[in-house]
Interface confidence: low
């Protein structure tokens, strides 16, 4: 499996999509896990509804949500309020019994928010500071939004 990179902005919601063959994975629940080390285990973060027919219902574990379009063959994971510690290697999985097939390997990278400017016209980026903790990061997004979610701050 090649690794697909998804770059999200700190404080925003990042949506990760994992396409799959809907017939091949018919009836299978899905999961999102975080790879622990290059050859380590993949630690489960969140999985779809226990009843496969209800896989379209969004399930949350903390700030991570999962939903599955079983007809279209697309698993969608949402990482809300993305933080630097969310960066890393993940997998989308298709579950069958105690086994899991990897649908996609995903590398999540966290960028700074260009609209979080401390000085007018001055952008702050990862290269300018030791860590994200130096800056105030407001909610912002460049992705599809969740229903009812208002991730952007009002303009001042």
């Amino acid at each position: 499996h090649n690794t697909t990179v998804f770059q999200g902005v700190a404080g925003q919601s990042l949506q990760v999509s994992c396409p799959y063959d809907s017939m091949k994975h018919w009836g299978r629940r899905k999961a999102w896990c975080r790879q622990l080390g290059e050859k380590g285990p993949c630690q489960r973060v969140v999985s779809t509804h226990n009843l496969w027919l209800l896989s379209f219902l969004r399930r949350w574990n903390g700030s991570t949500a999962i939903t599955d379009d079983t007809l279209g063959g697309t698993l969608t994971i949402t990482l809300r309020n993305l933080q630097p510690h969310d960066a890393g290697l993940y997998q989308c999985q298709s579950l069958h019994g105690s086994e899991a097939d990897t649908l996609r390997k995903v590398l999540v990278e966290v960028l700074a928010d260009p609209l979080d400017h401390r000085d007018a016209g001055d952008l702050w980026f990862p290269g300018e500071s030791e860590s994200f903790e130096d800056a105030h990061v407001e909610h912002s997004i460049s992705r599809s939004l969740l229903e009812g979610e208002i991730p952007f701050p009002p303009t001042s």
Epitope: T4, V5, F6, Q7, G8, V9, Q15, S17, E109, L111, P114, L115, D122, L123, W124, F125, P126, G127, E128, S140, I141, S142, R143, S144, L145, P151, F152, P153, P154, T155
Partner: antibody, heavy 120, light 108 residues
Framework: QVQLVQSGAEVKKPGASVKVSCKAS????????IHWVRQAPGQGLEWMGI????????SYAQKFQGRVTMTRDTSTSTVYMELSSLRSEDTAVYYC?????????????WGQGTMVTVSS | EIVLTQSPGTLSLSPGERATLSCRAS???????LAWYQQKPGQAPRLLIY???SRATGIPDRFSGSGSGTDFTLTISRLEPEDFAVYYC?????????FGGGTKVEIK
């Protein structure tokens, strides 16, 4: 399909202002950043700034600070870029561009470009 | 401001040949923050690569990106007739986002 359609070519005198529009369609307008990039004839690409169509907040390249204003109209899914105090070196094709899902600071959907000529 | 220098300025090759384009940054750019574009005359640029090595949607696998630090490379494994164009690199680690001056890939 997803597309950005820009306004037509403009000819302006030095010292004047120009306002270029960029109408988005085929996607949720408020969910993606829009950038502006320009290209002088026979030259390379130059990033001008970024606007968040949801809140309207902006950030501009220092070079254009004080001369450029980016705004949006959510009712028509249109972004505007106004450049004032025009000089001959502002003659260029001006592009609006949307960021893709995978990375918010690169540009995968571009407008067709608007040629702005500054000449006395 | 990060300055990106592309070389060579012009690359003369035949269809089927391998093209190697270079982009050098004036200061270190994390590999996560470099992109490549293709531009044909009279057209807007087209995103090829982001994150130094991730192909954008719909980009053929003959295009690949690599590199880190200050040196980055775009490789076209086997040139097709439609690949003859100008190629730009772009950094987005620091404001302002900047582009290289471009490399023109022309038919030999």
């Amino acid at each position: 399909q997803v597309q950005l359609v820009q306004s037509g070519a403009e000819v302006k005198k030095p010292g004047a202002s120009v306002k270029v529009s960029c109408k988005a369609s085929g996607y949720t307008f408020t969910s993606y950043y829009i950038h502006w990039v320009r290209q002088a004839p026979g030259q390379g690409l130059e990033w001008m700034g970024i606007i968040n169509p949801s809140g309207g907040s902006t950030s501009y390249a220092q070079k254009f600070q004080g001369r450029v204003t980016m705004t949006r109209d959510t009712s028509t899914s249109t972004v505007y870029m106004e450049l004032s105090s025009l000089r001959s070196e502002d003659t260029a094709v001006y592009y609006c561009a949307r960021a893709p899902q995978e990375s918010p600071y690169v540009f995968d959907i571009w407008g067709q470009g608007t040629m702005v000529t500054v000449s006395s | 401001e990060i300055v990106l220098t592309q070389s060579p300025g012009t690359l003369s090759l035949s269809p089927g040949e391998r093209a190697t384009l270079s982009c050098r940054a004036s200061q270190s750019v994390s590999s996560s923050y470099l992109a490549w574009y293709q531009q044909k005359p009279g057209q807007a640029p087209r995103l090829l690569i982001y994150g130094a090595s991730s192909r954008a949607t719909g980009i053929p696998d003959r295009f690949s990106g690599s590199g880190s630090g200050t040196d980055f490379t775009l490789t076209i494994s086997r040139l097709e007739p439609e690949d003859f164009a100008v190629y730009y690199c772009q950094q987005y680690v620091n404001s302002p986002f900047t582009f290289g001056g471009g490399t023109k890939v022309e038919i030999k």
